[in-house]
């Protein structure tokens, strides 16, 4: 296993700002197709602001208007509907808020009564606006590869709306999932539109996906299950993942690092820098610095990403997404090169390499 | 069938140590994990700490961090609470209990369900 | 951390009656609550997960309900082994907490 020499020393270089991190439930902010809707950044002494949608940076169009601290959406559509962040960057740090927008004309049920046979459950929705299935929530089902350690219990869900209410069954390999297809069978809540399998075994793995349907349309989804028999071992990171990276300076850059750990994975992003000249101490052992460290309120999802905002020269470099639990550590590096600015639009791009 | 037997509580002085034992069997050890709830005389209960007795990554409440340790045996099918600089306010009767995770594929969250107990034996701490 | 409230903290009821106790969590825990039942003397029995799930070998008449910060936990027709105490509890938030308990006593 590796050995760090972890850099303390704040003298080295400029250091990159603090960012904070939003750990509350995202505000929702819901429109009706056609719709106009305005929403304000909520952070305070924002000197320059950006937006983000899904994670992808989020410019003036015919139909979004951005002034100062104010996003519009002209005329929403339900294309509109996702995760939206803004990002204060100040001179100290950088702070971003998150929020969701839910372009629909469905109102589904809060209604959480046990059921056995589904769809009753929920309050029919507004009859005049008939929509077929959707996601409540993509971003949640990204992830579809899921290890879980055998005799442990697995929940999937499919949160969806539609009107009318859409009903959800399941399939295993492709094929209806049948409750004598496993020994104590599984069991279903639609109102949490989730399946649960207890005690899993080996012979539970295989491929889910919900089926979500109704009069409008279908849509399905499809996690793959694998049941690992316990033999402990150190986190497992993506393949290819972070990927090495360049953008120009000002521009914008993120290095993305998939762990899989059976055990709790504390995982950290470093940066190798110099010291007095030099990338290695007497003990020839790397200088690095942590940029970023999963905390007790940090999601996954915030973790596996490091995002570089407005790079400069200081910037290129290596970058390592290190992953340690009770077992070991694993860790995958990735490459920033840093271009000088043309006179045009900044551009990102990404190769899969990656060195280990 | 499950079963879960707890042994080493007793009477210690404030500042002393003790160490509970929980023989567990009828169940994959290495496959879940054991978790300890306390519940001092007359109160609620209140959860103590967790092994995973697959990798041993161990969580702790605030109250006891840093004075209780868990850690287990699997050739022994036995996970045992080491509790150093005890106080008045650790007495209490301490149970074991086998712990499984819930895997939510949507939120990615272990939900950790205590589903079998042990019979509890009882630590006072006293001068 | 994560503050679990049960109501009512005691109940008298009588043998056939429906009951219900609710459980409010300090901030939203999704699905991840049990309900545990403890007699006196003895150590608790689990007889719901993930909010609404019975556990295997739980009468039918104990039904789960809820996600975010509400839960409910109904015996729809109360048992003379019904009478003791019971506790919610979350597991999604750092530490695991437990409800202040509701005890149920016959009437």
């Known amino acids: 296993r590796p050995s760090f020499s972890l850099v303390e020393d704040t003298t080295l270089e400029p250091e990159e700002p603090p960012t904070k991190y939003q750990i509350s439930q995202p505000e929702v902010y819901v429109a009706a197709p056609g719709e106009s809707l305005e929403v304000r950044c909520l952070l305070k002494d924002a000197a320059v602001i950006s937006w983000t949608k899904d994670g992808v940076h989020l410019g003036p169009n015919n139909r979004t208007v951005l002034i100062g601290e104010y996003l519009q959406i002209k005329g929403a559509t339900p294309r509109d509907s996702g995760l939206y962040a803004c990002t204060a960057s100040r001179t100290v740090d950088s702070e971003t808020w998150y929020f969701m927008v839910n372009v629909t004309d469905a109102i589904s049920s809060g209604d959480d009564e046990d059921d056995t046979d589904g769809a009753e459950d929920f309050v029919s929705e507004n009859s005049n606006n008939k929509r077929a299935p959707y996601w409540t929530n993509t971003e949640k089902m990204e992830k579809r590869l899921h290890a879980v350690p055998a005799a442990n219990t697995v929940k999937f869900r499919c949160p969806a709306g539609g009107n009318p209410m859409p009903t959800m069954r399941w399939l295993k390999n492709g094929k209806e999932f049948k409750q004598e297809h496993r020994i104590g069978g599984y069991k279903v809540r639609n109102q949490h539109w989730s399946l649960i399998m207890e005690s899993v075994v080996p012979s539970d793995k295989g491929n889910y996906t919900c089926v979500v349907e109704n009069e409008y349309g279908s849509i399905n989804h499809t996690y793959h299950l694998d049941v690992v028999e316990r033999s402990p071992h150190r986190p497992i990171l993506q393949a290819g993942l972070p990927a090495n990276a360049s953008t120009v300076v000002g521009g914008d850059v993120e290095f993305v690092c998939k762990v899989y750990s059976d055990a709790q994975p504390h995982i950290q992003w470093i940066k190798h820098v110099e010291k007095n000249g030099s990338k290695y101490g007497p003990d020839g052992l790397p200088y690095l610095k942590v940029l970023k460290a999963a905390g007790v309120n940090t999601t996954d999802k915030e973790i596996e990403v490091l995002y570089i905002r407005n790079v400069t020269f200081e910037d290129a470099g290596e970058y390592t997404c290190l992953a340690g639990n009770s077992i070991g550590i694993s860790f995958h590096s990735a490459w920033l090169t840093v271009l000088p600015a043309p006179g045009r639009e900044k551009e990102i791009t990404a190769s899969p390499d990656y060195l280990e | 069938e499950v079963q879960l037997v707890e042994s080493g509580g007793g009477l210690v002085q404030p500042g002393g140590s003790l160490r509970l034992s929980c023989a567990a069997s009828g169940f994959p050890f290495t496959s879940q994990g054991i978790s300890w709830v306390r519940q001092a005389p007359g109160k609620g209960l209140e959860w103590v700490g967790r092994?995973?007795?697959?990798?041993?990554?161990?969580n702790y409440a605030d109250s006891v961090k840093g004075r209780f340790t868990i850690s287990a045996d699997t050739s022994k099918n036995t996970a045992y609470l080491q509790m150093n600089s005890l106080r008045a306010e650790d007495t209490a009767v301490y149970y074991c209990a086998r712990t499984y995770g819930i895997y939510d594929t949507y939120d990615k969250y272990t939900e950790y369900v205590m589903d079998y107990w042990g019979q509890g034996t009882l630590v006072t701490v006293s001068s | 951390d994560i503050q679990m409230t049960q109501s009512p903290s005691s109940l008298s009821a009588s043998v056939g009656d429906r009951v219900t106790i609710t459980c409010r969590a300090s901030q939203d825990v999704d699905t991840s609550l049990a309900w545990y039942k403890q007699k006196p003397g003895k150590a608790p029995k689990l007889l719901i997960y993930s909010a609404s799930f019975l556990y295997s070998g739980v009468p039918s008449r104990f039904s789960g309900s809820g996600s975010g910060t509400d839960f409910t936990l109904t015996i729809s027709s109360l048992q003379p082994e019904d009478f003791a105490t019971y506790y919610c509890q979350q597991s999604t938030g750092h530490p695991q907490t437990f409800g202040q308990g509701t005890k149920v006593e016959i009437k």
């Open positions: 092994t995973h007795l697959g990798d041993g990554s161990t």
